[in-house]
């Protein structure tokens, strides 16, 4: 029913995107399957803090970018926020996302990750810190701080439905994508599955959740046989290069 905002699972093929993609304008409802309705405008979401600028949060940017007010260098309250290039090692930072992949923010400085971000195999217990109590290594502040212990512990990569911070936190075949007010591991899209094609980075700020990207060897393209009046509302699917 329209009282429920049902999220597109990547297991469902060829469904119109619910918002921010080709599936209708915000506020519209798109019938996609018997008994399944997508509500374009999420009635449970309010955008009272949101400004329609290129980005609102880090995960709306590329893996080598972070979302910030250009004048401030860190995401703050108010002001235009755009995707900025990540900061290389030894540059100042306020959070992990500001640092380029392979680095993390320690004491306000981007430092190299000795264990390639989230090791997920063998890691020293001492670098887990908060993570020891986290259900999922991906979701904690699990970055090296002290290296006095040497006992080994094991962490598995996040499975589908697990909270994550970055795609590297998720198991193979999954990516870290927005899911309402959190980020969880979702399946990378397969051939024929609906994808979201953004005209430019940051244009998907209003999405209530994100799809993963298309899998290896696939590209998000307009479905050939899908003719609609509006160019902006054409259905995109993952297709072979």
């Amino acid at each position: 029913t329209l009282n429920s905002v049902l999220i597109n699972s990547n297991a469902i093929k060829n469904l119109p995107p619910p918002l921010g993609g080709a599936g209708g304008q915000p506020g519209s409802a798109v019938s996609v399957a018997p008994g399944v309705l997508y509500e374009g405008g999420n009635k449970y979401q309010t955008l009272d803090n949101y400004q329609p600028y290129p980005c609102a949060e880090d995960e709306e940017c590329g893996s080598d970018e972070y979302c910030s007010s250009p004048s401030r260098g860190a995401a703050g309250v108010g002001g235009v926020q755009i995707c900025l290039a990540c900061r290389k090692r030894r540059k100042r930072c306020m959070r992990h996302a500001m640092c380029c992949p392979g680095n993390y923010c320690k004491n306000g400085i981007c430092m190299p990750s000795d264990h390639s971000h989230f090791p997920r195999g063998e890691i020293e217990e001492s670098i887990i810190e908060n993570l020891g109590n986290d259900h999922n290594a991906a979701a904690g502040d699990g970055y090296p701080r002290r290296t006095t212990l040497t006992s080994k512990i094991y962490h598995t990569k996040g499975q589908e439905g697990s909270v994550c911070l970055r795609s590297s936190d998720c198991a193979a075949g999954l990516c870290c994508a927005r899911h309402f007010w959190s980020k969880i591991c979702k399946p990378v899209l397969k051939e024929g599955q609906v994808c979201t094609k953004h005209k430019r980075k940051g244009s998907h700020g209003l999405e209530i959740f994100q799809r993963c990207y298309c899998g290896e060897g696939l590209a998000c393209r307009i479905q050939k046989d899908h003719h609609q009046a509006s160019n902006s509302s054409r259905l995109h699917t993952c297709q072979r290069h």
């Epitope: 949060e57 999922n136 499975q159």
Partner: antibody, heavy 115, light 108 residues
Amino acid sequence: QVQLVESGGGLVQPGGSLRLSCAASGFTFNNYGMTWVRQAPGKGLEWVSGISGSGSYTYYADSVKGRFTISRDNSKNTLYLQMNSLRAEDTAVYYCARTIYMDYWGQGTLVTVSS
Amino acid sequence: DIVLTQSPATLSLSPGERATLSCRASQNLFSPYLAWYQQKPGQAPRLLIYGASNRATGVPARFSGSGSGTDFTLTISSLEPEDFAVYYCQQYLSLPTTFGQGTKVEIK
């Protein structure tokens, strides 16, 4: 270790207001979406509201929309729930919890709406 | 809204017995976006299972989650005295995220 501590509950008359706070520690607060869930006496769990890590995205249950406002101050590692126009049916223990599935919970704070 | 129906409402068992709790969704969840919680009187709920089958940190191996689509199960292989509590399932596929009404596991 991850800790969430709620405060601000109490007795309030119908139509009144309360502001709940949830102090978070033991994790990088702005990396996580946060959630408010409530439980009426002797009843089950009910989702109230959710907010993304930066505070840019907020979500509400129909039963509280327009009356409750979720917010966060990442510099203080604190989550808030401003509750206005309170009704008797809002009487419950209010919990703050981390993420969309609630991996860590506070101990709860009791809100009683009664004349 | 997606309605989650838990059964049975009450499960009367003895320590050492196997407990099987059911959670049925009114719509196909398609993805494993389901969690299980345990709640004891006067305490906050505690996450047991997320992603339908992933055990949370510190949760004993006797707890396991399974299922997909509309039918999900929480199994406690051998009940310990501390396992007697109320158990809730939660779907986080769609908004509003919803909980089941709970299953009380009591000592027989």
